[in-house]
């Protein structure tokens, strides 16, 4: 499937659209700090050098690889060393090293302010008056916020922006019919981008098997009915596709995308009985609703997993002949079974079964030692189930904002040294899984909270492994990914921890925070608890609830006060004198 | 002007049980914290329970299990139920109000104070 001229290719089997939009996705996902205008210019002049090459392949430099093109393309930024710094070191580099250099680059966790939304009409204006450059400064500023979102997703997202703007703009009530549609494409948006991000951290820390198996395990529960060979080339795809967008190569991603959901749509009745209405979209639609499909049912009178993996006398030949392929078929079995598990729960299970083959396989009587491995099973399914009836109970009793803080604190304890940005956006996203998946019924808890906590959790890897500060992140991050949650769970209190010294200055507040939104005030209060707790890590929940509490009291009562400033200055010291006699600082 | 009037003590017997209450007024009632403290003769005053303007209760160890503090908003009134008294809970308690748990809990720069009320417990 060899081509003369890659961009021509791709410009081809893309549309000019697509190519722009996702050029210049890749372009602000590798240099993160550039003007839009500089990047925009930048994916002009690729995108006229692609119409040359499909006017004729065999025009100069259409045979360079798409990671030619663009590397020697972005190393003409002027300002590469100044902005960047060590990254203009990668210029200097060939390929693909080079792009290995940029790939190592990106940062999760960008120097780059606050996205604030501009009043409704100042949007519909922005938007009337050049729709194209308002939708590709979206793509460009989720992009460079977001360097491994998902490309092809993302330019569906912009469909999205786009029609909501389209609708809106003309509506009665800008407002009433914008904002919500945004809120709800900012909150899938930062799921999206997490989720990928885990994939992501997959592929390139744990490698393709990894990758591989989390995929057959998921497609397995999604499409029980299809056959194994099915699900393998499917899982075999995907990885390509997700190999290719984690690496950087969006346009064969996008491309490769789009095959994958052609091949399941005209396969459908050997994969599943769910995706009928997904294949009846448009390209992005498609592939977002197959990505989304809920589990098609399992097939009627499915036999007893102990016949083909423990009862027949076959098992070690027939795991020595194929090691990966009969693990793969295990893992297939079972998870097409067990919709109600979560992925991580599955690979655990997979991960226990190839060990005890490993040493069964070697041993005198391999029957009688791995006659008894389902048992194995019992207290690697029962203990997630155990802790997401705890954690619901607690949310239940708690609600939302108060469920986070008891993680807050939870997770302050285990590892204070992490950065207290950084514990406030893990704790509170960790909390989410409450609203998530408490209301869901049993059979449906386990999947939606252990793999949500997994994405979560990989949000705490990624940001950590940019500036490490814990032996105890790192650990439980680094040593196997399908064990993040249960090693984070067993961390107990940090005892080698040294409390931060008191600094009246973390919590001196001002009027500022009574025009902040329910939710950034909850931040900053949230912000405060985390300090509390790196001042006295044993503090007890009733100290640090009456402290809360009378946080909450201060801002409500400075808030109502005629001279809020005067209110927070000497109603602040008094709460600040207060709490450090409670705690005993 | 703010006034706090403790009513309720009196003597009892070991083993049995008072009920005080604490009239507030010339304040915003619900948005303080309200607490229960007493003193000993010859000692320190020290604090018994504290409830939150959001109705979160706190209490001392002594306390715990034994006393109840509790608040009715619409009477302005704060309470607290004493059962199993023992003789060295033999004090003049105070009722005291403030916008801070912490500040009840630690006695720092409390707002308003009651007169108090006598609880003698023989045994």
């Known amino acids: 499937d060899a081509h003369k001229s890659e961009v021509a290719h791709r410009f081809k089997d893309l549309g000019e659209e697509n190519f722009k939009a996702l050029v210049l996705i890749a372009f602000a996902q590798y240099l993160q700090q550039c003007p839009f205008e500089d990047h925009v210019k930048l994916v002009n002049e690729v995108t006229e050098f692609a119409k040359t090459c499909v006017a004729d392949e065999s025009a100069e430099n259409c045979d360079k690889s798409l990671h030619t093109l663009f590397g020697d393309k972005l190393c003409t930024v002027a300002t590469l060393r100044e902005t960047y710094g060590e990254m203009a070191d990668c210029c200097a580099k060939q390929e693909p090293e080079r792009n290995e250099c940029f790939l190592q680059h990106k940062d999760d966790n960008p120097n780059l302010p606050r996205l604030v939304r501009p009043e409704v009409d100042v949007m519909c204006t922005a938007f009337h008056d050049n729709e194209e450059t308002f939708l590709k400064k979206y793509l460009y500023e989720i992009a460079r916020r977001h360097p491994y979102f998902y490309a092809p997703e993302l330019l569906f997202f912009a469909k999205r922006y786009k029609a909501a703007f389209t609708e809106c703009c003309q509506a009665a009530d800008k407002a009433a019919c914008l904002l919500p549609k945004l809120d709800e494409l900012r909150d899938e948006g930062k799921a999206s981008s997490a989720k990928q991000r885990l994939k992501c951290a997959s592929l390139q820390k744990f490698g393709e098997r990894a990758f591989k198996a989390w995929a057959v395990a998921r497609l397995s529960q999604r499409f029980p009915k299809a056959e194994f060979a099915e699900v393998s080339k499917l899982v075999t795809d995907l990885t390509k596709v997700h190999t290719e967008c984690c690496h950087g190569d969006l346009l064969e991603c996008a491309d490769d995308r789009a095959d994958l959901a052609k091949y399941i749509c005209e396969n459908q009745d050997s994969i599943s009985s769910k995706l009928k209405e997904c294949c009846e979209k448009p390209l992005l639609e498609k592939s977002h609703c197959i990505a989304e499909v809920e589990n098609d049912e399992m097939p009627a009178d499915l036999p007893s997993l102990a016949a083909d993996f423990v009862e027949s006398k076959d098992v070690c030949k027939n795991y020595a002949e194929a090691k990966d392929v009969f693990l793969g078929m295990f893992l297939y079995e079972y998870a097409r079974r067990h919709p109600d598990y979560s992925v991580v729960l599955l690979l655990r299970l997979a991960k226990t079964y190839e060990t005890t083959l490993e040493k069964c396989c070697a041993a005198a009587d391999p029957h009688e030692c791995y006659a008894k491995v389902f048992d194995e099973f019992k207290p690697l399914v029962e203990e997630p189930q155990n802790l997401i009836k705890q954690n619901c109970e607690l949310f239940e009793q708690l609600g939302e904002y108060k469920f986070q803080n008891a993680l807050l604190v939870r997770y302050t304890k285990k590892v204070p040294q992490v950065s207290t940005p950084t514990l406030v956006e893990v704790s509170r996203n960790l909390g989410k899984v409450g609203s998530k998946c408490c209301k869901h019924p049993e059979a449906k808890r386990m999947p939606c909270a252990e793999d949500y906590l997994s994405v979560v959790l990989n949000q705490l890897c990624v940001l950590h492994e940019k500036t490490p500060v814990s032996d105890r992140v790192t650990k439980c991050c680094t040593e196997s990914l399908v064990n993040r949650r249960p090693c984070f769970s067993a961390l107990e209190v940090d005892e080698t921890y040294v409390p931060k010294e008191f600094n009246a200055e973390t919590f001196t507040f001002h009027a500022d925070i009574c025009t902040l939104s329910e939710k950034e005030r909850q931040i900053k209060k949230q912000t405060a608890l985390v300090e509390l707790v790196k001042h006295k890590p044993k503090a007890t929940k009733e100290q640090l609830k009456a402290v809360m509490d009378d946080f909450a009291a201060f801002v409500e009562k400075c808030c109502k006060a005629d001279d809020k400033e005067t209110c927070f200055a000497e109603e602040g010291k008094k709460l600040v004198a207060a709490s450090q006699a409670a705690l005993g600082l | 002007e703010v006034q706090l009037v403790e009513s309720g003590g009196g003597l009892v017997q070991a083993g049995g049980s008072l009920r005080l209450s604490c009239a507030a007024s010339?304040?915003?009632?619900?948005?303080?914290?309200m607490g229960w403290f007493r003193q000993a003769p010859g000692k320190q005053r020290e604090y018994v329970a504290v409830?939150?303007?959001?109705?979160?209760?706190y209490y001392t160890n002594s306390a715990k299990g034994r006393f109840t503090i509790s608040r009715d908003n619409a009477e302005n009134t704060v309470y607290l139920q004493m059962n199993s008294l023992k003789p060295e809970d033999t004090a003049v308690y105070f009722c005291?109000?403030?916008?801070?748990?912490?500040?009840?809990?630690?006695?720092?720069?409390?707002?308003?104070w009651g007169q108090g009320t006598q609880v003698t417990v023989s045994s």
């Open positions: 409830i939150s303007s959001s109705d979160t209760t």
């Open positions: 005291a109000a403030d916008s801070f748990v912490t500040a009840l809990q630690t006695l720092t720069q409390i707002n308003y």
């Open positions: 010339g304040l915003s009632f619900s948005r303080y914290a």
